[in-house]
């Protein structure tokens, strides 16, 4: 395949930590155009595996505020509106990238960090272990 | 009390774009310790709103590979294993941060970007609009 040379307009890479320390422009570009399906903010109530949202704020992190899902029930809501314990509500988790201020309180220096967040809940059939 | 100024070890902030352009250390720190509940990789099959995972790769993005969920059915799987169209399978979406190489092909210069990803699916009661 054709190899694309490094862009001559790239910033200087003479830093001894290169390429582990990079320059990042924090003016966020939002790729979420109208072609994306609309996010519904009421799924957490309408789901058969409903969840509550808990606010987690850390000013040393970017993004500073993350809303985390916690499943309301062990079981799932059935057609009668009751909790059915033959099914399980489980969190759907995702590993996401955040920026952590390093050193602390520095406005212009960060470290990349991976954290696991619960985004919502789904209803699954339980794994049944049969005793021989 | 003694007042502590901003951390004196902060990198230089004389850049004209400061604080929008920052230094980021790409040596990822992973906060996902064993205290986190185990992420189950089979929920996508066991869910009453199952989903398929599609690989999205973009070498100009960090992380380059993102797995996206697409709900398998419009309805949800009932106790008999059939699709019940009185319920809806919907994607649970989350806005995440990624780094986009800017200018393109530069190994040490990025721009922060927000993208909307589907993490999994959940089963919801539909909103019924009654015609007067």
């Amino acid at each position: 395949g054709i190899t694309i040379p490094r862009n001559p307009g790239c910033p200087n890479s003479e830093d001894k930590n290169f390429p582990r320390t990079v320059m990042v422009n924090l003016n966020i570009h939002n790729r979420n155009t109208n072609t994306n399906p609309k996010r519904s903010s009421d799924y957490y109530n309408r789901s058969t595996s409903p969840w509550n949202l808990h606010r987690n704020e850390d000013p040393e992190r970017y993004p500073s505020v993350i809303w985390e899902a916690k499943c309301r029930h062990l079981g799932c809501i059935n057609a009668d509106g009751n909790v059915d314990y033959h099914m399980n509500s489980v969190p759907i988790q995702q590993e996401i990238l955040v920026l952590r201020r390093e050193p602390p309180h520095c406005p212009n220096s960060f470290r990349l960090e991976k954290i696991l967040v619960s985004v919502g809940c789904t209803c699954v059939t339980p794994i049944v272990h049969h005793v021989a | 009390g003694i007042t502590i100024p901003r951390n004196p070890g902060c990198p230089n902030s004389e850049d004209k774009n400061f604080p929008r352009t920052v230094m980021v250390n790409l040596n990822i720190h992973n906060r996902n310790t064993n205290t986190n509940p185990k992420r189950s990789s089979d929920y996508y099959n066991r869910s009453t709103s199952p989903w398929n995972l599609h690989r999205n790769e973009d070498p100009e993005r960090y992380p380059s590979v993102i797995w996206e969920a697409k709900c398998r059915h419009l309805g949800c799987i009932n106790a008999d294993g059939n699709v019940d169209y009185h319920m809806n399978s919907v994607p649970i979406q989350q806005e995440i941060l990624v780094l986009r190489r800017e200018p393109p092909h530069c190994p040490n210069s990025f721009r922060l970007e927000k993208i909307l990803v589907s993490v999994g699916c959940t089963c919801v009661t539909p909103i019924v609009h009654h015609v007067a």
Epitope: S41, Y44, R55, E57, S64, P107 | -
Partner: antibody
Framework: EVQLVQSGAEVKKPGSSVKVSCKAS????????IHWVRQAPGQGLEWIGV????????LYNQKFDGRVTLTADESTSTAYMELSSLRSEDTAVYYC??????????????WGQGTTVTVSS | DIQMTQSPSSLSASVGDRVTITCSAS??????IDWFQQKPGKSPKRLIY???DLASGVPSRFSGSGSGTDYTLTISSLQPEDFATYYC?????????FGQGTKLEIK
């Protein structure tokens, strides 16, 4: 221009409810939380709660003991605060203010003009 | 809940004076302080965010500092338009409590 425009003054009877609106313009509504703060006559600022128009998440000051409900309508970029079982001590100016989720260093940078709620029999 | 105590609760000063307002947290907060200015009949206006940083359009005579439990707002040379009530707010701990306010009056 970024602004938050609140609904007009209200006079309510004890035991009734009030719903105050806060219409946002000039920015992406879902990028910011909306916090609500009140100020009784001659008193300081009191945090009521926060709503995230994006996820639908809410967090309330426990002092309000289930009497407050915060909602948002993304289609009109409007946030709402409803306070029920009103009592005379709820007489105050109610403010909405936006809060940057991505960069909470930016704090409560823009405020509504305030809505005066008077509770009187 | 973390309580924020401002001192003094009121203060008389003259134009040109250097003024310091303090805000003490009931426990050490691994966090930051915002400072707000409010004039009668007006909405609060953010002055300082993240303990140290001047909000857009705020004159450089205002400055903030502090850590742990003790935080300070300093006005290096009072101007006539600075006479108002000042509030601190802690950021990052539930709930985001405000101090009770410091009323700065003309001597």
């Amino acid at each position: 221009e970024v602004q938050l425009v609140q609904s007009g003054a209200e006079v309510k009877k004890p035991g009734s409810s009030v719903k105050v609106s806060c219409k946002a313009s000039g920015y992406t509504f879902t990028d910011y939380e909306i916090h609500w703060v009140r100020q009784a006559p001659g008193q300081g600022l009191e945090w009521i709660g926060v709503n995230d128009p994006d996820s639908g998440g809410t967090l309330y000051n426990q002092k309000f003991d289930g009497r407050v409900t915060l909602t948002a309508d993304e289609s009109t970029s409007t946030a709402y605060m409803e306070l029920s079982s009103l009592r005379s001590e709820d007489t105050a100016v109610y403010y909405c203010t936006r809060y940057d989720k991505w960069y909470s260093f930016e704090g409560m940078d823009i405020w509504g003009q305030g809505t005066t709620v008077t509770v009187s029999s | 809940d973390i309580q924020m105590t401002q001192s003094p609760s009121s203060l008389s000063a003259s134009v040109g004076d250097r003024v310091t307002i303090t805000c003490s947290a009931s426990q050490g907060i691994r966090s930051y302080i915002d400072w707000f200015q409010q004039k009668p009949g007006k909405s609060p206006k953010r002055l300082i965010y993240a303990t140290f940083d001047l909000a857009s359009g705020v004159p450089s005579r205002f400055s903030g500092s502090g850590s742990g439990t003790d935080y300070t707002l300093t006005i290096s040379s009072l101007q006539p338009e600075d006479f108002a009530t000042y509030y601190c707010r802690q950021v990052g701990n539930y709930p985001g409590t405000f101090g009770q306010g410091t009323k700065l009056e003309i001597k």
